[in-house]
Amino acid sequence: TQHGIRLPLRSGLGGAPLGLRLPRETDEEPEEPGRRGSFVEMVDNLRGKSGQGYYVEMTVGSPPQTLNILVDTGSSNFAVGAAPHPFLHRYYQRQLSSTYRDLRKGVYVPYTQGKWEGELGTDLVSIPHGPNVTVRANIAAITESDKFFINGSNWEGILGLAYAEIARPDDSLEPFFDSLVKQTHVPNLFSLQLCGAGFPLNQSEVLASVGGSMIIGGIDHSLYTGSLWYTPIRREWYYEVIIVRVEINGQDLKMDCKEYNYDKSIVDSGTTNLRLPKKVFEAAVKSIKAASSTEKFPDGFWLGEQLVCWQAGTTPWNIFPVISLYLMGEVTNQSFRITILPQQYLRPVEDVATSQDDCYKFAISQSSTGTVMGAVIMEGFYVVFDRARKRIGFAVSACHVHDEFRTAAVEGPFVTLDMEDCGYNIPQTDESTLMTGRA
């Protein structure tokens, strides 16, 4: 059994600068960028866990101020704590940076629950365990927040890696990754390997353990097994994709595929759960319950509220089904599927269990804003955000948690007709009505 224990994060990686300095062809993403250079400095540069987010170390300002920043593919602002807050160990002090420039503009971001607000500016930003470059980027200095920072999460800001269309206050505020690509020779691509531990980690264990890797500008072949399969990015706002079929233990949910993408389907590292539209969630839970009917769990468990506990080491993984999401492929009428295990969608919870118990929350939940493929999905896979070619790649992660009987999988091709019909066309509304609400 692979428990997902990983080596401690290397704090001082030496070595030559990354071999990513080749000029980019305008329309051409480098052929398999992972072969172009060494990504050793970026491997294992994430820490954290699905319940509280994965973060990367970044430096801001001159002299550099080091902060831990949540990696979020579901938003597009680079925003950092810039005032004292009970849950922050440190924060960005603009007055200490000689390179800070005030944009004299405020920004307010409301969530379904909670919010943050701040002041916009620019400063010099770099990623110590990333490409050897420094960029001037927009920064939202968070001066006030409610239910945004998480006690004990160890991150002080958020790196929104999605597109300008969903940036706040509007799409004229260039996101960090756009600035990075414009100002450097870093290819327009990044990849994420999020590594769930498979068991609860306390605070000190999280600090000492590896949460995964964010490879900026390329693909690292050591982080996945098998082949990468790509699905088109439907629209460049969120990382929107199209799901064409859903199976529970190989049994088709048999719903109109539009339901799976109502009103969108996105890949979002800043969300914990796999979130499904109401109708799809109800059908999926019904099917999961049926598949695991030898045991019965409380209603609150399926709502993601109550924890179910088993004596340590006796979790009956075999009674829970695998879940397969079929994604639109790059070729007409071709799809591929990604399959996750209960080891991904049952999330270990710390602090409640005794050493005699393993306790879990059901990490699939209902959504009113479409499907969200959050950390519990991403923890099964190495995910390539190939912005240059407007596609997202999935391969089985080298660090995913599994057992001796089953493993996560990425398989294809499958013949699927009329996949374009699976996309939902959202009626045009004022962008300011968008609410970001993520569990």
Epitope: T294, K296, D299, Q306, L307
Partner: antibody, heavy 120, light 108 residues
Framework: QLQLQESGPGLVKPSETLSLTCTVS??????????WGWIRQPPGKGLEWIGS???????YYNPSLKSRVTISVDTSKNQFSLKLSSVTAADTAVYYC????????????WGRGTLVTVSS | EIVLTQSPATLSLSPGERATLSCRAS??????LAWYQQKPGQAPRLLIY???KRATGIPARFSGSGSGTDFTLTISSLEPEDFAVYYC??????????FGGGTKVEIK
Amino acid sequence: QLQLQESGPGLVKPSETLSLTCTVSGGSISSSSYYWGWIRQPPGKGLEWIGSIYYSGSTYYNPSLKSRVTISVDTSKNQFSLKLSSVTAADTAVYYCARVGHGISYFDLWGRGTLVTVSS
Amino acid sequence: EIVLTQSPATLSLSPGERATLSCRASQSVSSYLAWYQQKPGQAPRLLIYDASKRATGIPARFSGSGSGTDFTLTISSLEPEDFAVYYCQQVYTWPPRTFGGGTKVEIK
């Protein structure tokens, strides 16, 4: 209406096995809406959960008692049973059987209880 | 492990008075908490579940409140039959197994 009734010997010798049965009447033990559980209460003390069982036979036990406890179900007789091995005086208690309802979370219906004394 | 602490251990009141019983969890149990009443020589009886919902047949004078770590059982006006021991139980972690130590409500 549904009722639960515990039965079994009131006196058990130390080191022997305590055996109790709970008979469910007025309803089916095979309902998918309930678990069935055993709880005990030493004289003058509080309540201690022993374990629970589903009609399929799936069981959950209190970790502190797990090595000594077996709970089983007989759907044909509408009964579930408790066996507690290697008993000592500390196992002297009133033993209750109960239904776990309200979203399979709370003990919403209890038997009257039976006192089991462990003594030589 | 989640520990439930009930206070006071004993509450001495007269019929007609208001009784306020407390149950504190060592960490949040959301609203997954129940209250049981146990009279001498009898089995416990479910009074309140999900912190504030009255079980079938329970008089309106019994009410539950709270969420997270602090919970209260209130008996608005004590009847003679209400003098008993009251237990809280959390089911945030399942299977249900953790009870508080009990509060005895006795006649003053």
